[in-house]
């Protein structure tokens, strides 16, 4: 044992981090120790393959020890780079271990669960138009378009709750083609379109 | 390199059970969902099920519920698929293959040629 | 369930010819459709994924369109090395079409 030797301690542990599919990403983690410690990443307590296992995969061991993904991979079912990572610094005199940080997968599905559908209501009635929109995570916001532009919602008469269009009471100029638009961090989805029709 | 290596051929008897196992190496077994599909001779291409090497969750088309059990042993990444009552129509090469993060079987196994027959 | 329908089952083509294969599925899949080639005795080659994406190494004569139930693989000057089976697949919940044979005429 030298004098000056100290064992690992984590100075910069990894963060939370919410990416797109497809995108690169960093799980940052940086120590301290000497002699100058080795990091490994583990993932659901079992040790993360990098380009020094293989140089050919999409995660790399950055000099720093920060974990780097050139892309996220995520499908519907394969799912390699979601979940809960720390990395482990050691040295001869001992190890040292970083706060636990999730990596979640940003998705937005294609396929409205429910599209609106056509409504046909008299003027002055009360019309509602109803939405599922994709699958998502985060959970996507719900928006409406009117004839290909985005719908006043601060006309009072106006109410989006939910996957709902509600029109207390129906003017003439509501009449239109109405879709409703799924958002969160990956994009947007537009639904098929509903026609509203307003009868004299 | 990444690759899936199953077992070998195997002839059995109508009635009989058959157990096929697929070796992957080269990248995180738990992550990636793996298929099972068969092939009659001259025949097309037909999807038996997956198994999520996670969790060990499967699912399969209702034709074969109930006749067919996948599983896998995490600490050697294989997958194993098991057919019973095995018929004369089950003569095919049954293949594992595991599915990208794009949704499509990227890598297979070689194959393994089963034979029912009295 | 999904059916995937194929078409044609069997064409017949000389090495510069431009191949179209159509695949169509039962309801919308969105983009979640693949193609793969197959040759006698080997595993299925993966070509195409999310209906247009050339897989790593592909070489670039094939390509893939369409999305909800419309699809097609092309193949835009077939080489020799061309000539096999071609098998559409929806990742949707899984099924594959029954298949294309590409013959030399």
């Known amino acids: 044992l030298r004098q000056e030797d100290f064992p690992p301690r984590i100075v910069e542990h990894p963060s939370d981090l919410i990416v797109s599919k497809g995108e690169p990403a960093t799980l940052n983690c940086k120590a301290e120790g000497r002699p100058t410690p080795t990091i490994e990443w583990y993932k659901g307590g079992e040790r993360v393959e990098t380009d020094k296992d293989d140089p050919r995969s999409h995660r790399m061991l950055l000099p720093s020890g920060s974990l780097f993904f050139l892309r996220i991979v995520h499908g519907r079912k394969s799912r390699p780079d979601e979940g809960v990572y720390v990395c482990v610094a050691r040295n001869y005199l001992g190890e040292a271990v970083s706060h636990n940080a999730s990596l979640e997968v940003a998705i937005l599905r294609d396929d409205f669960r429910q599209n609106p559908s056509d409504v046909m209501v008299a003027v002055g009635e009360p019309a509602v138009m109803e939405c599922q929109p994709p699958r998502g995570h985060p959970e996507p916001t719900i928006s409406w378009k009117k004839d290909g532009s985005p719908l006043d919602d601060k006309d009072e008469r106006i109410t989006i709750r939910g996957g709902k269009l509600m029109i207390t009471y129906t003017r003439k100029s509501d009449a239109g083609k109405y879709v409703c638009v799924g958002t969160n961090m990956v994009g947007e989805r537009e639904s098929e379109v509903a026609e509203l029709t307003v009868l004299e | 390199e990444v690759q899936l290596v199953q077992s070998g051929a195997e002839v059995k008897k109508p009635g009989a059970s058959v157990k096929v196992s697929c070796k992957a190496s080269?990248?995180?077994?738990?992550?990636?969902?793996m298929h099972w599909v068969r092939q009659a001779p001259g025949q097309g291409l037909e999807w038996m099920g997956w198994?999520?090497?996670?969790?060990?969750?499967?699912e399969f088309p209702q034709k074969f519920q109930g006749r067919v059990t996948m599983t896998r042993d995490t600490s050697i990444t294989t997958a194993y698929m098991d057919l019973s009552r095995l018929r004369s129509d089950d003569t095919a090469v049954y293949y594992c293959?595991?599915?990208?993060?794009?949704?499509?079987?990227?890598?297979w196994g070689q194959g393994t040629m089963v034979t029912v027959s009295s | 369930d999904i059916v995937m329908t194929q078409s044609p089952s069997s064409l017949s083509a000389s090495v510069g010819d431009r191949v179209t294969i159509t695949c169509r599925a039962s309801?919308?899949?969105?983009?979640?459709l693949n193609w793969y080639q197959q040759k006698p005795g080997k595993a299925p080659k993966l070509l195409i994924y999310?209906?247009?994406s050339l897989q790593s190494g592909v070489p670039s004569r094939f390509s893939g369109s369409g999305s909800g139930t419309d699809f097609t693989l092309t193949i835009s000057s077939l080489q020799p090395e061309d000539f096999a089976t071609y098998y559409c697949?929806?990742?949707?919940?899984?099924?594959f079409g029954g298949g294309t044979k590409v013959e030399i005429k």
């Open positions: 309801q919308s899949i969105s983009s979640y």
């Open positions: 697949q929806q990742s949707y919940s899984t099924s």
């Open positions: 198994i999520n090497p996670r969790s060990g969750v499967t």
């Open positions: 293959a595991r599915e990208s993060g794009d949704d499509a079987f990227d890598i």
């Open positions: 999310a209906a247009s």
């Open positions: 080269g990248y995180t077994f738990r992550g990636y969902a």
